[in-house]
Interface confidence: low
């Protein structure tokens, strides 16, 4: 009698159970009653990760560098490529299909978390008692200097853009 | 809403080249990739090329080998198509359409297309 | 390159009725197929993208569906305004590549 199920890695056709195709591997013909699956490797821009019969491998991701890609991992026969954005830039959107320059803080404003390949760079106000005078995608707000531990006084307070400036203390008094 | 103005209608003869221009209407073209997309006369789509204003890198479809050259001129907003050595079957409608960089290949905006008609 | 295949060649709806047209790759785009309207005269105007996504702007009656190699859009209740050609774009490999188009003209 003729199955109408087929163990685990085997497909059904024409009334009998075939084996299916190895990852990496697309399909030719089906099995007859007197041969077995005829599979044949997936050339080398091409790949299939799951057990198949598929009559087409797929065809790897393209990282394109005009729009700041490159390969992270080279595609195998068995799984596709993974691009990730050239240094100094980052995903634009989640399906990555484009990269863009990292983003900098203000002065005013410092990294909270710097950027990586898939988000951009977190910049976050300097509190009171730090500064930031440049506009960078690295450098977090900076402490005011203490004018105390130099045995010096504040001449003129700090911003968050600027650093307080010591001076000497009035010995006058 | 980018709005792209191109080039009006060229006639030219077998052999020569034809230059189209897009002009954007935003100030800054490199948030956006500009794609070259031809249809001559009763045919589908059929895409040439693609160009990156940010760094101007290009991608063109082979089977024009070498006949196309994108470039573009990012303080002026435009963006051009040269397609040399035309033969009659060069006869269609040639559209800029640019894409937003956060999905670089939609075709978002496109220009009102214009006209090349090869012919001795 | 990737082929893509669009059915029907000819479509005739009634106004009001649903309308689904067919695009099928020659290999797996995954999602990466737009859908394009083209009136006599003028330039495609983008409806889908990423297979499902519908550009802002789009009325709701459009909807895009499928992955892979099998991919869909569907119009819901056909206004006037809707009859034109429809194509569909593959942006999974260069050189991109556009279906044939589906006329869908008045019944």
């Known amino acids: 009698e003729p199955p109408t199920a087929c163990r685990e890695k085997q497909y059904l056709i024409n009334s009998q159970c075939c084996s299916l195709c190895q990852p990496g591997q697309k399909l030719v013909s089906d099995c007859t009653e007197f041969t077995e699956t005829e599979c044949l490797p997936c050339s080398e821009s091409e790949f299939l990760d799951t057990w198949n019969r598929e009559t087409r491998c797929h065809q790897h991701k393209y990282c394109d560098p005009n729009l700041g890609l490159r390969v992270q991992q080279k595609g195998t026969s068995e799984t596709d490529t993974i691009c990730t954005c050239e240094e100094g830039l980052h995903c634009m959107s989640e399906s990555c299909e484009s990269c863009v320059p990292h983003r900098s803080c203000l002065p005013g404003f410092g990294v909270k978390q710097i950027a990586t390949g898939v988000s951009d760079t977190i910049c976050e106000p300097c509190p009171v008692g730090f500064f930031s005078n440049v506009s960078s995608a690295f450098e977090k707000c900076r402490p005011w200097t203490s004018c105390e531990t130099k045995d010096l006084v504040v001449q003129q307070a700090g911003t968050n853009k600027t650093d307080v400036v010591c001076g000497p203390q009035d010995r006058q008094r | 809403q980018v709005q792209l103005v191109q080039s009006g209608a060229e006639v030219k003869k077998p052999g020569a080249s034809v230059k189209v221009s897009c002009k954007a209407s935003?100030?800054?073209?490199?948030?956006?990739?500009v794609n070259w997309v031809r249809q001559a006369p009763g045919q589908r789509l059929e895409w040439m090329g693609l160009?990156?204003?940010?760094?101007?890198?290009?991608s063109y479809n082979q089977k024009f080998k070498g006949r196309v050259t994108l470039t573009i001129d990012k303080s002026a907003s435009t963006a051009y198509m040269e397609l040399s050595s035309l033969r009659s079957e060069d006869t269609a409608v040639y559209y800029c359409?640019?894409?937003?960089?956060?999905?670089?290949?939609?075709?978002?905006?496109w220009g009102q297309g214009t006209l090349v008609t090869v012919s001795s | 390159e990737i082929v893509m295949t669009q059915s029907p060649a000819t479509l005739s709806v009634s106004p009001g009725e649903r309308a689904t047209l067919s695009c099928k790759a020659s290999?797996?785009?995954?999602?990466?197929v737009a859908w394009y309207q083209q009136k006599p005269g003028q330039a495609p105007r983008l409806l889908i993208y990423?297979?499902?996504d519908r550009r802002t702007g789009i009325p709701a009656r459009f909807s895009g569906s499928g992955s892979g190699t099998e991919f869909t859009l569907t119009i819901s209740s056909l206004q006037s305004e809707d009859f034109a050609v429809y194509y569909c774009?593959?942006?999974?490999?260069?050189?991109?590549?556009f279906g044939q188009g589906t006329k869908v003209e008045i019944k």
């Open positions: 935003v100030y800054s073209f490199t948030g956006y990739t």
């Open positions: 290999q797996n785009v995954h999602t990466r």
């Open positions: 160009i990156n204003p940010y760094n101007g890198g290009t």
């Open positions: 774009l593959q942006h999974w490999t260069y050189p991109l590549t």
């Open positions: 359409a640019s894409s937003p960089y956060s999905n670089p290949y939609a075709m978002d905006y």
């Open positions: 990423l297979a499902s």
